[in-house]
Interface confidence: low
């Protein structure tokens, strides 16, 4: 297993609809054709896996049907979008990239993107 550098933004604020997007960029040492991207969340000293996708270079990322993540790839960049976020989902979201094929296998883990989620205030009752 060889190490690889992964860069991602330090902070992202989710939209009022609970959607957060960020770019995960990896320094590919070779011509990878198969890449696996995993988003991890770290909060309260617990790490969880949010979503994962394997894709062939140049193709769309395919997450599981019930995943809260979507994404697109462009060269060595992956544009990730996480949906359905609530205030309780605030935390450090870490991008993990694996170059699966061809060998050798490379692994890179970013420093994480702190995603802040603020639940929208309910609209006050109004006669208008």
């Amino acid at each position: 297993c060889k190490a690889m550098h992964v860069a991602q933004p330090a902070v992202v604020l989710a939209s009022s609809r609970g959607i957060a997007s960020f770019v995960c960029e990896y320094a590919s040492p070779g011509k990878a054709t198969e890449v696996r991207v995993t988003v991890l969340r770290q909060a309260d000293s617990q790490v969880t896996e949010v979503c994962a996708a394997t894709y062939m270079m140049g193709n769309e990322l395919t997450f599981l049907d019930d995943s809260i993540c979507t994404g697109t790839s462009s060269g060595n960049q992956v544009n990730l979008t996480i949906q359905g976020l609530r205030a309780m989902d605030t935390g450090l979201y870490i991008c993990k990239v694996e170059l699966m094929y061809p060998p050798p296998y490379y692994l890179g883990i970013g420093n994480g993107t702190q995603i802040y989620v603020i639940d929208p205030e309910p609209c006050p009752d109004s006669d208008f």
Epitope: R36, T38, L40, V47, T48, E49, A52, D66, K96
Partner: nanobody
Framework: EVQLVESGGGLVQPGGSLRLSCAAS????????MAWFRQAPGKEREFVSA????????AYADSVKGRFTISRDNSKNTLYLQMNSLRAEDTAVYYC??????????????????WGQGTLVTVSS
């Protein structure tokens, strides 16, 4: 309904290896986090290791870190625990369990909804 059946236990000498398997039936098993727990004679059941739904994330108890490896094959609905450098204190009944969430790797029993019957691992010379 999820059913879990463990296998692979047995008698092994200290320093030896064993590979436990847990065959799962039911869709929930392959789409949720899974874990291994163990219960030594006269002791409470304790967390050993857990793995996320896609296998991308794992967690281990400090006592087994570097010796045990958890993995899963969702195409076969099977969870594995490779145990190396076994010690006498690893003697226990090993249980596999299915968590109620996809991604969260919990360390406490009450976070797991389905349990197998267990397989006995005895480490002795």
């Amino acid at each position: 309904e999820v059913q879990l059946v463990e296998s692979g236990g047995g008698l092994v000498q200290p320093g030896g290896s064993l590979r436990l398997s847990c065959a799962a039936s039911g869709r929930t098993a392959s789409s949720n986090a899974m874990a291994w727990f163990r219960q030594a004679p006269g002791k409470e059941r304790e967390f050993v290791s857990a793995i996320s739904a896609t296998g991308g994330l794992t967690a281990y108890a400090d006592s087994v870190k570097g010796r045990f490896t958890i993995s899963r094959d969702n195409s076969k609905n099977t969870l594995y625990l490779q145990m190396n450098s076994l010690r006498a204190e690893d003697t226990a009944v090993y249980y596999c369990a299915v968590g109620r969430e996809r991604w969260y790797l919990r360390h406490t029993e009450n976070e797991y909804d389905y349990w197998g019957q267990g397989t006995l691992v005895t480490v002795s010379s």
